[in-house]
């Protein structure tokens, strides 16, 4: 039975040209995290595998950095980076947990972080 909860950074905003950290945290389960995938819509950005470490998709190598922790850092942001991002936790013996983050990349300097929220 899947009892875990994913907490994410929720709805966030950042300035064009800047960087942002995407963070998820899995709690309320004793399941072992074997891998975390980071996706933008249906594109795989990066994988953090418990056995192998990090793998960044070749098309994102220049602008994506692993960490901190199981999070992901997006750099040199453009307006095209606005959209949904997903952290997908593969766990034994539970299964698959998914968290959602919405990033808005702004032209001005009024970007502020949104509130945290939880996804069951």
């Amino acid at each position: 039975m899947m009892t875990g909860t994913i907490e994410t950074t929720g709805n966030i905003s950042a300035e064009k040209g800047g960087s942002i950290i995407l963070q998820c945290h899995l709690s309320s389960t004793t399941a072992q995290v074997t891998q975390v995938n980071w996706e933008q819509q249906d594109q795989l950005l990066a994988i953090c595998n418990a056995d192998l470490g990090w793998h960044i998709s070749p098309s994102f190598k220049d602008r994506v950095a692993p960490g901190p922790g199981l999070g992901l850092t997006l750099q040199s942001l453009t307006v095209n980076d606005t959209g949904e991002y997903f952290c997908i936790y593969h766990t034994y013996p539970d299964g698959t947990y998914t968290g959602r983050i919405f990033l808005e990349v702004l032209e001005s300097s009024v970007a502020e972080h949104g509130a945290r929220f939880q996804i069951p």
Epitope: T34, D51, L52, H90, Y92, P93, G95, T96, T98
Partner: antibody
């Protein structure tokens, strides 16, 4: 070309043991999660056991826990399934499968090796 | 365990027909649904992963859709080589269960 070749199947007595092997080639074996899927005579598919790329994590179907052991030798590019205390319901065609790097699905399957448990 | 129910269990259609198979999960599985094709005497082959993503090398006449509990697999124009049994499989919760299969035949 990705190739998965199973061996070790056969006819075994009730309560007996058998060890299946899967020789992998055409890809970096040590980078992929691998598993065993069986297909019963009624054509039902079941994920029996899985093992992470480095062998740190294993999963077993409840009905085989304590009887089956999945393992891998990354130096030999080989996946194993040690089966003991075999039951008649273990009769099936056993497939060796590779998982996508994303772990979303099994993207390659071997041709299978048949296991028949008889009394 | 999550039960996966496919319908129909078998179907017969003509070459060029649009063929649709449905898969229903007993609980929410988000988009964690895969489709496999198994030709007689062969191993299953991955066609669609994560509900709608076409696996590399798979013809574009195959497609998938759905989320939550209801999913659809479509062959837009049935070809003779599509004679096979098609299985759905959920990847949300262990054990990752399969549907019972849908056998597709040519009229």
């Amino acid at each position: 070309d990705v190739k998965l070749v199973e061996s070790g199947g056969g006819l075994v007595k009730l309560g007996g043991s058998l060890k299946l092997s899967c020789a992998a080639s055409g890809f970096t074996f040590s980078s992929y999660t691998m598993s065993w899927v069986r297909q019963t005579p009624e054509k039902r598919l079941e994920l029996v056991a899985a093992i992470s790329s480095g062998g740190s994590y294993t999963y077993y179907l409840d009905t085989v826990k304590g009887r089956f052991t999945i393992s891998r030798d990354n130096a030999k590019n080989t996946l194993y399934l040690q089966m003991s205390s075999l039951k008649s319901e273990d009769t099936a065609l056993f497939y060796c499968t590779r998982w996508l790097l994303s772990l979303y699905a099994m993207d390659y399957w071997g041709q299978g090796t048949s296991v028949t448990v008889s009394s | 365990d999550i039960q996966m129910t496919q319908s129909p269990s078998s179907l017969s259609a003509s070459v060029g027909d649009r063929v649709t198979i449905t898969c229903k999960a007993s609980q929410n599985i988000n988009v964690w649904l895969n489709w496999y094709q198994q030709k007689p005497g062969k191993a299953p082959k991955l066609l669609i992963y994560k509900a709608s993503n076409l696996q590399t090398g798979v013809p574009s006449r195959f497609s998938g859709s759905g989320s939550g509990t209801d999913f659809t697999f479509t062959i837009s124009s049935l070809q003779p080589e599509d004679i096979a049994t098609y299985y759905c499989q959920q990847g949300q919760t262990y054990p990752f269960t399969f549907g019972q299969g849908t056998k597709v035949e040519i009229k």
